[in-house]
């Protein structure tokens, strides 16, 4: 449905507050270094312009595309060249090239200060003094640090953020009420950002077909009672929503997501029995709830897959007539029967099936050729099952912190060229798979673990892409989206790596470590562990464990000392000497 003025259309659909919030998110995700006040000024100018278009859709410039309007506005920023360097060159381009140029300059790891949480009373005062500014600052700070955050979902987080302050700033014990809520929002926010980053990477690096395949598999697991045609419609609509959000078209994305939620709720009888509660909620909660809804029960008495996809004499005929539709049906049928498989495993099976048909349908006796295709699936299924079993056993034996350390060592040996902060961040997140997934029964472990690992390894891929240092990482990240995890799992110690020279400064610690939170202290120790492995990649587990145990004892001892700084200086030298001797450095 064509509208005379796209900006008026979106303003009317979204309302002023959602319009302003989404434009702020869009601008902050593009110009990540700009001060808050500058963005607010730009947003207010766009909003006032949108209102003139609502009043008269034929008014000057109201017929321009949103990319043109927003791009023109961003290009008015006076300090564009000095703040962003070559990104300023985007402004010399015409749409759609200008928007593509802005997208290419989004920075997954912007050089921004860490967000430090003020005292609760300070936050509550700021909230009460100017609620609007306080909440907009939240949107701005999250958006610029997470330039691919799913915009309509960020509105949901902001709504919860507001609710937390509204409730807790009136509570008797403000901190006890507020801090756990903020911790939960922070952790959920990081997870949401990482999940969306994988969706955008899938679309941008591997194309729409790859994303649609992922969506068919996931939605078929979630809605196994839905017909293939229904799943296909949902996949098409969902692909449009995510393509728009990943492309910076946040107003369209948010509006289309609302329409999709409306459609799902109006047709829940033919989609899933699990949607009733979600569909009674207000819009933002409804969309979030649908995205997280549990898998529906599988229909009883589903026939064997072999009949249509192996035994039928029409397999090659059906495949030739509409390859992607036939493969989509295979994926749908397999996924709805296997909520116990990860999405990436289902996609590997579909790829194997496709490769087999490509080969066999050109053979003299196609049926004879593809008759045993399902046998090829067995090793593909067993590989992640065995890996998860082994790693969950290791996790249960070690606990989360030491399990993370085992992964730190493993991944530093695989790809020692990667920066230490990236290795620490990624390995810590990989290690969280234990507490997240190992508690689940067998039937839920693989979808939990392997699909989570896909999200974390994508973090490694996008961070590495910014500053590529390892051909092995590039290879695993770019060859196949669904085989990233097996590719990294298969990497052995990098024998070509020249060990890093020893630098005593890297292993010099001060009394400030004593005042850090447990998490920050762990990160310090894990940073030292990565550096140790980079110095001595051939160090055994036992050697590294001994050094880390000594290090933990050293920190504990000096943090209890009266003169902490002297203790760190003197005992630190002894520890470095002892560690060098133990590792043969």
């Amino acid at each position: 449905d064509a509208h005379k003025s796209e900006v008026a259309h979106r303003f009317k659909d979204l309302g002023e507050e959602n319009f302003k919030a989404l434009v702020l998110i869009a601008f902050a995700q593009y110009l990540q270094q700009c001060p808050f006040e500058d963005h607010v000024k730009l947003v207010n100018e766009v909003t006032e312009f949108a209102k003139t278009c609502v009043a008269d859709e034929s008014a000057e410039n109201c017929d321009k595309s949103l990319h043109t309007l927003f791009g023109d506005k961003l290009c008015t920023v006076a300090t564009l060249r000095e703040t962003y360097g070559e990104m300023a060159d985007c402004c010399a381009k015409q749409e759609p090239e200008r928007n593509e140029c802005f997208l290419q300059h989004k920075d997954d790891n912007p050089n921004l200060p860490r967000l430090v949480r003020p005292e609760v009373d300070v936050m509550c005062t700021a909230f009460h003094d100017n609620e609007e500014t306080f909440l907009k600052k939240y949107l701005y700070e999250i958006a610029r640090r997470h330039p691919y955050f799913y915009a309509p979902e960020l509105l949901f987080f902001a709504k919860r953020y507001k609710a937390a302050f509204t409730e807790c700033c009136q509570a008797a014990d403000k901190a006890a009420c507020l801090l756990p809520k903020l911790d939960e929002l922070r952790d959920e926010g990081k997870a949401s950002s990482a999940k969306q980053r994988l969706k955008c990477a899938s679309l941008q690096k591997f194309g729409e077909r790859a994303f649609k395949a992922w969506a068919v598999a996931r939605l078929s697991q979630r809605f196994p009672k839905a017909e293939f045609a229904e799943v296909s419609k949902l996949v098409t609509d969902l692909t449009k929503v995510h393509t728009e959000c990943c492309h910076g078209d946040l107003l369209e994305c948010a509006d289309d997501r609302a329409d999709l939620a409306k459609y799902i709720c109006e047709n829940q009888d033919s989609i899933s029995s699990k949607l009733k509660e979600c569909c009674e909620k207000p819009l933002l909660e409804k969309s979030h709830c649908i995205a997280e809804v549990e898998n529906d029960e599988m229909p009883a008495d589903l026939p064997s897959l072999a009949a249509d996809f192996v035994e039928s004499k029409d397999v090659c005929k059906n495949y030739a007539e509409a390859k992607d539709v036939f493969l989509g049906m295979f994926l749908y049928e397999y996924a709805r029967r296997h909520p116990d498989y990860s999405v990436v495993l289902l996609l590997r099976l579909a790829k194997t099936y496709e490769t087999t048909l490509e080969k066999c349908c050109a053979a003299a006796d196609p049926h004879e050729c593809y008759a045993k295709v399902f046998d090829e699936f067995k090793p593909l299924v067993e590989e992640p099952q065995n890996l998860i079993k082994q790693n969950c056993e290791l996790f249960e034996q070690l606990g989360e912190y030491k399990f993370q350390n085992a992964l730190l060592v493993r991944y530093t040996k695989k790809v020692p060229q990667v920066s230490t902060p990236t290795l620490v961040e990624v390995s810590r997140n990989l290690g969280k798979v234990g507490s997240k997934c190992c508690k689940h029964p067998e039937a839920k472990r693989m979808p939990c673990a392997e699909d989570y690992l896909s999200v974390v390894l994508n973090q490694l891929c996008v961070l590495h892409e910014k500053t590529p240092v390892s051909d092995r990482v590039t290879k695993c990240c770019t060859e196949s989206l669904v085989n990233r995890r097996p590719c990294f799992s298969a990497l052995e110690v990098d024998e070509t790596y020249v060990p890093k020279e020893f630098n005593a400064e890297t292993f010099t610690f001060h009394a400030d470590i004593c005042t850090l939170s447990e998490k920050e202290r762990q990160i310090k120790k894990q940073t030292a562990l990565v550096e140790l492995v980079k110095h001595k990649p051939k160090a055994t587990k036992e050697q590294l464990k001994a050094v880390m145990d000594d290090f933990a004892a050293f920190v504990e001892k000096c943090c209890k000392a009266d003169d902490k700084e002297t203790c760190f200086a003197e005992e630190g030298k002894k520890l470095v000497a002892a560690s060098q001797a133990a590792l043969g450095l």
Partner: nanobody, 128 residues
């Protein structure tokens, strides 16, 4: 043209109650949300309450929370505002607004620009 007509205003003593009604009629329209705004002399029009037809969710300005209740009949495109414990500062012209956005505001705040059709207003006076 969509017609929006309010009724039920009047003079009431502080602490008293009033019930405003609003009916939207005329051309077929997509009214996702209907709401009430008010305007006191010399002041800007301010949001009072709104109701979304999709989920029946209600929103209120902080100043009226717990005292006012909005309800409606989607089939009739009618919305009501039950006003209890009225205060002199509630004195204003009350406007009914239709053709609101299909989205609910993330922060619960509606603006006059969100609505496409308006009534002429009904005067509410609260005497002390």
């Amino acid at each position: 043209e969509l017609q929006v007509v309010e009724s039920g205003g009047g003079l009431v003593q502080a602490g008293g109650s009033l019930r405003l009604s609003c009916a939207a009629s005329g051309r077929t329209f997509r009214s996702n949300t209907m709401g009430w705004f008010r305007q006191a002399p010399g002041k800007e029009r301010e949001f009072v309450a709104a109701i979304t037809w999709s989920g029946g969710t209600t929103y209120y300005a902080d100043s009226v929370k717990g005292r006012f209740a909005i309800s409606g009949d989607n089939a009739k495109n009618t919305v009501y505002l039950q006003m209890n414990s009225l205060k002199p500062e509630d004195t204003a012209v009350y406007y009914c607004a239709a053709e609101g956005p299909k989205w609910e505001p993330w922060n619960g705040i509606y603006h006059p620009a969100d609505f496409g059709s308006w009534g002429q207003g009904t005067q509410v006076t609260v005497s002390s």
